[in-house]
Interface confidence: low
């Protein structure tokens, strides 16, 4: 049929933090490049029906289903989902194509199903069918990569037994220390499984799929570097492969490297050597020690020796089960309103942990940094001086760990007041927790200096939203104070705040706040 319009159906994946149900509009979000969904004419269907390729979406992902129509004149449209009509607003792009979009924010089970788009153009009517389902991630796994020697070649293969099959990449860096951070220009990434260039300073292999990204660093002893003050330590679980690389550079080729475990030379077949000349014509040698599947008796000090360099050792510890070692006692901190402060947790763990920081039911990304002594540290500085409970949670394949922190912000009390027919209450969230006084204002005491002690009840309560403490004081109404102005004052080491309340008949009460420093 010559009159049929040219239809293009695309899926746009969004990286967004918003949450809402389907919106039929263009919605401002950070987007991935569009994926063509085909949109083929459906054979043997009554009327003109186009069918887009099935769309699989992760839970909570945000997408846009978009149709581009190359047809003359205006178009009108209607979306139908689960027998409900949804508003449809076509617009035209720079090439004068009609564009119709359906935005699905934060995909849920209820938003999965068939989305029908009915389009009416001047020439013809047609229907476009999208089928959206939630990706089943229950069977997904992401395993930490490990190394194998390539048969008959001086090369390493990086393997990650994950589902769906991961993209494997080598992350290489030839600089020292900080400049080997992931985003650094010194870092080179190679999306391949086999690596021949094994002479670099820092070699990691990473595997990524829909579940995230896991990396393994090639453990290296560099004989040209000053040995660490504490012996480097490598943990492995029984059955895992062991790889240690010893690297040395010398002015000429007249040197050799050897590996020993507890002063006994490694057996043939548990090491291999490579050498190359660097750009300045010095010789680089590397000697790998490897065990394809470690047992408990592979534990010990592995020492790399050279005829021209001081020897260096590493302690290899084989464990039956992974662990996370850290002190889990809760910690309380008290800081000033503008004081710089970070929570930190120091831990030793194997395998590497996945972690989160949580505050007020909101999770924050967790970064971890290795220290020279075999420990790692995770810091959280993004508290924005909000008082309350902060939780650090870490887990690996075999262990879990949770640590609680309380943050208190030192500040002068601020008082809020409310009153009912029978009582008046004042609240304050200052820190340290304030003390209270109630004063009666009368002809005898125009400055409100007459203290009230009868009928006062003080308490501290946890304001659940932020996990911070709120102090309150309640004054029970008595005939002696009815109709008078009373003043509640909260004070701590940083100052005092007061609120004045008129105790009369029920109804709206006028409050007057006094700030006394």
């Amino acid at each position: 049929n010559q009159d049929l319009p040219v239809i293009k159906c695309v899926l746009i994946n969004h990286k967004n933090n918003d949450s809402s149900v389907g919106k039929s509009s263009s919605y401002p979000m950070v987007s991935e490049s569009p994926e063509d969904l085909g949109c083929a004419l459906r054979p043997q269907s009554s009327g003109t029906v186009y069918e887009a390729a099935a769309v699989e979406v992760d839970v909570s992902a945000s997408i846009t289903l978009q149709v581009l129509v190359d047809a003359p004149g205006n178009i009108s449209c209607l979306w139908v989902f689960k027998h409900s009509s949804l508003n449809c607003q076509p617009h035209f792009d720079l090439q004068n194509r009609g564009v119709v979009s359906m935005v699905i924010l934060k995909m849920t089970e209820t938003q999965a199903g068939e989305y029908l788009l009915f389009i009416q153009s001047e020439a013809t009517n047609y229907t476009i069918l999208f089928t959206v389902s939630i990706r089943n991630t229950l069977l997904y796994t992401l395993r930490r990569p490990y190394f194998r020697k390539m048969e008959n070649q001086d090369a390493l293969v990086c393997i990650s037994e994950s589902v769906p099959e991961p993209i494997v990449e080598w992350v290489l860096c030839d600089s020292q220390g900080e400049s080997c951070k992931e985003e650094s220009p010194a870092v080179v990434k190679k999306e391949e499984k086999v690596l021949h260039e094994l002479f670099g300073t820092d070699i990691r292999c990473c595997a990524r799929n829909e579940l995230g990204r896991e990396c393994t660093r090639l453990f290296t002893i560099d004989l040209n570097q000053t040995p660490q003050t504490t012996l480097p330590q490598l943990f492995l679980k029984v059955g895992e492969p062991l790889w240690i690389r010893c690297k040395a550079v010398h002015v000429n080729h007249g040197f050799g490297l050897t590996w020993e475990l507890e002063n006994k030379a490694l057996e043939e077949g548990n090491y291999f050597e490579m050498s190359t000349y660097s750009t300045n014509r010095t010789m680089i040698r590397i000697l790998f020690a490897f065990v394809s599947s470690v047992a408990r008796n592979d534990t010990g000090y592995y020492t790399c020796s050279s005829s021209k360099h001081p020897s260096q050792s590493a302690l290899v510890t084989i464990v039956e089960k992974g662990f996370i070692n850290a002190t889990n006692s809760s910690e309380d901190y008290e800081i000033d309103q503008y004081e710089e402060f970070c929570f930190s947790v120091r831990f030793k763990a194997y395998p590497q942990i996945r972690c989160t920081w949580t505050f007020s039911r909101k999770s924050f990304p967790c970064e971890q940094k290795g220290l020279d002594n075999g420990y790692s540290i995770s810091k959280f500085c993004n508290h924005k001086h909000q008082p309350g409970e902060y939780i650090f949670h870490a887990e690996n394949d075999d262990a879990q760990f949770t640590k609680m922190f309380t943050l208190n912000i030192r500040r002068k009390p601020q008082v809020l007041a409310e009153a009912s027919a029978s009582q008046a209450s004042c609240f304050s969230d200052g820190y340290p927790l304030p003390s209270w006084t109630w004063k009666k204002c009368s002809d005898k005491s125009p400055n409100c200096t007459e203290e009230i002690t009868e009928g006062v009840w003080n308490r501290k309560a946890n304001r659940k939203v932020f996990g911070q403490w709120v102090s309150s004081s309640t004054l029970n109404m008595s005939e002696a104070i009815k109709g008078f102005l009373v003043k509640c004052c909260a004070y701590n080491s940083l100052g005092t705040s007061c609120e004045t309340i008129l105790l009369n008949s029920p109804g709206p009460f006028p409050f007057i706040q006094d700030n006394i420093s």
Partner: antibody, heavy 120, light 107 residues
Amino acid sequence: QVQLVQSGAEVKKPGASVKVSCKASGYTFTNYFMHWVRQAPGQGLEWMGIINPSGGSTSYAQKFQGRVTMTRDTSTSTVYMELSSLRSEDTAVYYCARAHTVYYYGMDVWGQGTMVTVSS
Amino acid sequence: DIQMTQSPSSLSASVGDRVTITCRASQSISSWLAWYQQKPGKAPKLLIYAASTLQSGVPSRFSGSGSGTDFTLTISSLQPEDFATYYCQQSYSTPWTFGQGTKLEIK
């Protein structure tokens, strides 16, 4: 527009070295890898190696290891390929080609080629 | 090294024909395959990457398919400007390797 401009043809004697340059323009030089590929007369394409202009790191095909050196000058957005100990079988057209850092995107922009003739 | 084998090494066809060139890898390379077109005296031109993705600016009569070890380049309707040599190339692991080329000639 994005382009790679290579240096002119060279005639060399066996045992000598040749240094071919490739000047990039129209894109951020350090954001893409650069490959060198050669083609002997009437033959197919042969990959020689790759350089990352960002850090200067290289990876060479085993066949050329020890004879080839790839370098770059970020101030002029130029990469260089030097081949030493030339033999007659090194007579070929040498191409530089840009590639995305995610390898499977292929080599999307090529230089015009530099003919190197090795003859006594 | 991964060997790439193209077939046929040459083929004759006419304008309007549908042409298929195959490429086989000596081991699985997932979808890490590109196709190039080269005309005499010119540099190669990228047609397809990631086995099936058309490089921008390349006519839609070119298409690629396959994954693992077997790949295909198809030209749905030959045009006069399509007569050239075609190469496949893997970027799964270094060294990157090319097929030996398929020369497409006018019948």
